[in-house]
């Protein structure tokens, strides 16, 4: 038995920040779980990990270069990524493991979310129009 994960197909980070919501076919209330966010088609780079426990606050771990926070919903974990750079544009996959209560469960691979980080570009000021020629 596998947990299904739904993610937005694409998110655009205009202000170098984005909320990526991972929605699960499983209620996380009063569960001990590990939710994680992985970068790249092969999910090779784990960028955020959230541990949830019925008796403690969420514990959020971030990879160097990623400023990550997590928020828990009944059937979701939302990863809040800040200070993103253009070169962190990529596809990101949500993963979930539930440890307690038994049985241990994990997820079917999701379709992922493409996060497109828009660079901060200064808008060029319009040129001062010169005198029009007759």
């Amino acid at each position: 038995n596998k947990i299904l994960v739904k993610q937005s197909p694409m998110l655009v980070a205009y202000d170098n920040a984005v909320n990526l919501s991972c929605k699960y076919s499983y209620n996380l209330f009063s569960r001990e779980f590990r939710a994680s966010l992985h970068k790249g088609l092969d999910s090779a780079v784990e960028v955020c990990v959230v541990y949830g426990n019925y008796s403690q606050q969420l514990q959020v771990y971030s990879k160097t270069g990623f400023n990550c926070d997590g928020k828990l919903g009944n059937e979701s974990v939302t990863f809040y990524l800040q200070n993103l750079y253009v070169n962190q544009t990529d596809i990101y996959f949500c993963k979930i493991e539930v440890m307690y209560p038994p049985p241990y469960l994990d997820n079917e691979k999701s379709n992922g979310t493409i996060i497109h980080v828009k660079g901060k570009h200064l808008c060029p000021s319009p040129l001062f129009p010169g005198p029009s020629k007759p």
Partner: nanobody, 121 residues
Amino acid sequence: DVQLVESGGGVVQPGGSLRLSCAASGSFFSIDTMDWYRQAPGKQRELVTGVTSGGLTNYADSVKGRFTISIDNAKNTVYLQMNSLRPEDTALYYCSARIRTSGGGGWSTYWGQGTLVTVSS
């Protein structure tokens, strides 16, 4: 069974430094996370910092910029470098680890006995 052994505690003056170590031993598949908690007299145990085997980190606001955590996966050991120590850092520091005892998934949480850090002039 899995054992966690802390070392490196002691007495240090305000502004000084200490380096704590926590080594995991026994029979297990892999380590997920290794964390440091602390408990001061009459206070609740609080999370100080933690690290995953992949090097992802987590710091309490009160220690950011002063404490640095690192992990040596080959030695199953976590290190806590504590700089600019303050009297309010005085506490018993406990190591905690989420450890996978088999490759089939799931983890268990283990605790060490603690090492005392006293910051006093």
